[in-house]
Interface confidence: medium
Amino acid sequence: FKVATPYSLYVCPEGQNVTLTCRLLGPVDKGHDVTFYKTWYRSSRGEVQTCSERRPIRNLTFQDLHLHHGGHQAANTSHDLAQRHGLESASDHHGNFSITMRNLTLLDSGLYCCLVVEIRHHHSEHRVHGAMELQVQTGKDAPSNCVVYPSSSQDSENITAA
């Protein structure tokens, strides 16, 4: 399987909420012995490999934000810790995997990475990640709502998030 990032850039005004999204593509094994570990973290555009550096999102590490579930299940992060920081990660039955960040500030700007690990315990593991940029703007040049820019593999028109 692969991870697709429908949008490579999110431009949002300060104070807005945004949902960053990754999507699993290709055949996904949903057998009993397969589990998925999904998480989010901040990173920087490394010269060698994007997403190789793992930094916290609002002081929450990738361990704090992780989802771990069987191949056929949906999942949400444990609400307490994440929601206190205005964060929630979720995964649905259709391969969509997201993190919602509430009340954005300029400090939230940066590169965000999703990581998915397909695990057949003691047999194999397959790791894939996706990256996207979040720009939080303030002042007269800031958009009134979040504007998302599709990844290059998709239609290049701007799409305004609902």
């Epitope: 990738f62 990581l115 315990h121 003691h122 194999s124 593991e125």
Partner: antibody, heavy 116, light 111 residues
Framework: EVQLVESGGGLVQPGGSLRLSCAAS????????MGWVRQAPGKGLEWVGI???????YYASWAKGRFTISRDNSKNTLYLQMNSLRAEDTAVYYC??????????WGQGTLVTVSS | DIQMTQSPSTLSASVGDRVTITCQAS???????LAWYQQKPGKAPKLLIY???TLASGVPSRFSGSGSGTEFTLTISSLQPDDFATYYC????????????FGGGTKVEIK
């Protein structure tokens, strides 16, 4: 009979090397994850590393660079190569088979003593 | 590093007592990947419980396991003479890399 038998332990000087073997019988080593776990005298269990079915090998952070796990499927044997040994590596070393989600089959262990 | 913390480290009990041992992980463990072992002096560990609550083959029903997330428990409902031993929890983690972590052990001794 399904069993694991470790060998290769003994006395070695600090800075020295040792290779432990774990001979499997009654099953095919290549079909299972195989791990090494050690236990210092009077202490608890400490994970060393594992080779999973796909061939990926993982180590405890302290073992990276000094310890190497390998397997020889034709001999049905698992190995642990230990280099730059220190006094704190003194322990009984167990090999263990990954059964489903856990270690279900263990060897009897082999004692490694690092001392001058 | 990931830590598995067991408590108590030593437990004095009598035959017939109900005994509870707890294991706390420094990060969430998928319950399928949590196991308990029993070890007697000079012997290799023996698997008691896997997937947090499933009894291994041949293990008496007085042993039970429970818990999820970061908190797990091993309970012996009525301690028997053969149960005086050291018990270890073990969890597997895949992030950031594969790690098997063992708890420090709980020695159950005769009161």
């Amino acid at each position: 009979e399904v069993q694991l038998v470790e060998s290769g332990g003994g006395l070695v000087q600090p800075g020295g090397s040792l290779r432990l073997s774990c001979a499997a019988s009654g099953f095919s080593l290549s079909s299972y994850a195989m791990g090494w776990v050690r236990q210092a005298p009077g202490k608890g269990l400490e994970w060393v590393g594992i080779i999973i079915v796909s061939g990926n090998i993982y180590y405890a952070s302290w073992a990276k660079g000094r310890f190497t796990i390998s397997r020889d499927n034709s001999k049905n044997t698992l190995y642990l190569q230990m280099n730059s040994l220190r006094a704190e590596d003194t322990a009984v070393y167990y090999c263990a088979r990954g059964d489903g989600y856990t270690y279900g089959l263990w060897g009897q262990g082999t004692l490694v003593t690092v001392s001058s | 590093d990931i830590q598995m913390t067991q408590s108590p480290s030593t437990l004095s009990a009598s035959v017939g007592d109900r005994v509870t041992i707890t294991c706390q992980a420094s990060q969430s463990v998928y319950s399928r990947y949590l196991a308990w072992y029993q070890q007697k002096p000079g012997k290799a560990p023996k698997l008691l419980i896997y997937s947090a609550s499933t009894l291994a083959s041949g293990v008496p029903s007085r042993f039970s396991g429970s818990g999820s997330g970061t908190e797990f428990t091993l309970t012996i409902s009525s301690l028997q003479p053969d149960d005086f031993a050291t018990y270890y929890c073990q969890g597997t983690f895949y992030i950031p890399d594969y790690i098997d972590g063992f708890g420090g052990g709980t020695k159950v001794e005769i009161k």
